[in-house]
């Protein structure tokens, strides 16, 4: 089911236990460490001690990352997988998650996504079923990583606040982002709204409050009038290019 995928993920075993324990009751799934690396304060890893964030699936990485083995040959054969930087427009890809926000994988190339090209309720997974080298397809995590177009054609896209696994589960103008203990469909950010600017790829782990990316024509930048002693907790907002 949707939520247990996130909460029972194999990769969770790599994380430290929840601070102070306390979350899930007996009989519930598991109390996930909510903020392995926090968005503010001094909780970010520094460049000196930075280590790649281990993962088992794309959903554990940020919106600008995907989960893969750093060396191609080791993929899916017990090699360590980490969150890698997403691929920009016109770069090679094997699945949508590899492409940066606003793009999707078409014929092995990251292309700009345009929701108007997809019939309502259609999932953006049309070309990846035939890719035999998609290592996530055989992740052995007990649920189908990909759903064929035919079975999804009549599926209503997730509305704001409903649970999701990936952004293609959500309606136009929404992305799939973590909020509290689950992943839900959240609005793509508009001008002036608070956004999250990560220090570097993979620096944020399982944030408990992920945000969508800024909408078209906007970039996530430090709020100009926001002067604060602590650089790491400065607010970033979506601003015009």
């Amino acid at each position: 089911t949707l939520n247990s995928v996130l909460i029972n993920s194999n990769a969770i075993k790599n994380l430290p236990p929840p601070l102070g324990g306390a979350g899930g009751q007996p009989g519930s799934a598991v109390s996930v460490a909510p903020g392995v690396l926090y968005e503010g304060g001094n909780k970010y890893q520094t460049l000196d001690n930075y280590q790649p964030y281990p993962c088992a699936e794309d959903e554990e990485c940020g919106s600008d990352e995907y989960c893969s083995s750093p060396s191609r040959g080791a993929a899916g054969v017990g090699g360590v997988q980490i969150c890698l930087a997403c691929r920009k427009r016109r770069k090679r890809c094997m699945r949508h998650a590899m492409c940066c926000p606003g793009n999707y994988c078409k014929n092995g190339i990251c292309m700009p996504s345009d929701h108007s090209h997809f019939p309502r309720g259609e999932i953006e997974e049309s070309i990846i079923e035939n890719l035999g080298n998609d290592h996530n397809a055989a992740a052995g995590d007990g649920y189908p990583r990909r759903t064929t177009l035919t079975s999804k054609i009549y599926h209503t896209k997730g509305q704001e606040g409903s649970v999701c696994l990936r952004s293609s589960d959500c309606a136009a103008g929404l992305c799939c982002a973590r909020h509290f203990w689950s992943k839900i469909c959240k609005p793509v950010l508009k001008e002036g709204q608070v956004c999250t600017k990560h220090k570097r790829k993979g620096s944020h782990g399982l944030e408990i409050f992920q945000r969508c990316y800024c909408g078209e024509g906007l970039a996530c930048r430090i709020q100009k009038d926001h002067h604060q002693a602590s650089n790491s907790s400065r607010l970033h907002t979506c601003q015009r290019h």
Epitope: T1, L2, N3, S4, I7, N8, P18, L19, G20, A22, G23, G24, Q25, G27, S28, A29, V30, S31, P34, G35, Y38, E39, G40, G41, K43, T156, G158, Q159, E160, G161, S162, V163, H179, F180, W181, S182, I184, K186, G192, Q193, V194, T196, E207, I208, F209, R211, S233, L235
Partner: antibody
Framework: QVQLVESGGGLVQPGGSLRLSCAAS????????MSWVRQAPGKGLEWVSV????????YYADSVKGRFTISRDNSKNTLYLQMNSLRAEDTAVYYC?????????WGQGTLVTVSS | DIALTQPASVSGSPGQSITISCTGT?????????VSWYQQHPGKAPKLMIY???NRPSGVSNRFSGSKSGNTASLTISGLQAEDEADYYC???????????FGGGTKLTVLG
């Protein structure tokens, strides 16, 4: 439109039990996490518990842990709160809330009074 | 225990702007660039006004805005109107207990 209607509140003696229900309509109930939030008379809001859309995960406030149990029946679009070993300090209006992007929709609440 | 601290009351005249503060710690409000605000009229259920620091749900007036600096979040209401008179609650998340936390609430009085 989204509607949440609580029921099951009433007067109960300390140590007693009560089961609250929340009937949901106007949205795909099985796609949302749901919470209970309470408010003692003249006091502020206090989060009580949350349950995942598929019931696989539950979380509780320390003040009710071990005494209250949250559950849901997606086939009936209903959320429940089983309250055992009730204390005077549990007296409050209990709201069920849809836990989408935070508590984006609330019921009107049901009053639970614990008194001898 | 109230984890987030709000002033018990604030007041302002119609047309004025007021700001309600909400102070937490590094384990809750300060640990995340995240906070929500709710409005509650007497005898009514709370209503979500702001989420994720400064995002307004559809249908909420743009007179309501949110911000955050360090361990303190703020709700600003501009162009005060009589119907804004209500209790306002901030809400965040506490990582040590893995739970949702609310502020104690602030009663807003619109004078005149």
């Amino acid at each position: 439109q989204v509607q949440l209607v609580e029921s099951g509140g009433g007067l109960v003696q300390p140590g007693g039990s009560l089961r609250l229900s929340c009937a949901a309509s106007g949205f795909t109930f099985s796609s949302y996490w749901m919470s209970w939030v309470r408010q003692a008379p003249g006091k502020g809001l206090e989060w009580v518990s949350v349950i995942s859309s598929d019931s696989s995960s539950t979380y509780y406030a320390d003040s009710v842990k071990g005494r209250f149990t949250i559950s849901r029946d997606n086939s009936k679009n209903t959320l429940y709160l089983q309250m055992n070993s009730l204390r005077a300090e549990d007296t409050a209006v209990y709201y069920c809330a849809r836990h989408g992007i935070d508590f984006d929709h609330w019921g009107q609440g049901t009053l639970v009074t614990v008194s001898s | 225990d109230i984890a987030l601290t709000q002033p018990a009351s604030v007041s302002g005249s119609p047309g004025q702007s007021i700001t309600i503060s909400c102070t937490g710690t590094s384990s809750d409000l300060g640990g995340y660039n995240y906070v929500s605000w709710y409005q509650q009229h007497p005898g009514k259920a709370p209503k979500l006004m702001i989420y994720d620091v400064n995002n307004r749900p559809s249908g909420v007036s743009n007179r309501f805005s949110g911000s955050k600096s360090g361990n303190t979040a703020s709700l600003t209401i501009s162009g005060l109107q009589a119907e804004d008179e209500a209790d306002y609650y901030c809400q965040s998340y506490d990582s040590p207990t893995d739970s949702v936390v609310f502020g104690g609430g602030t009663k807003l009085t619109v004078l005149g």
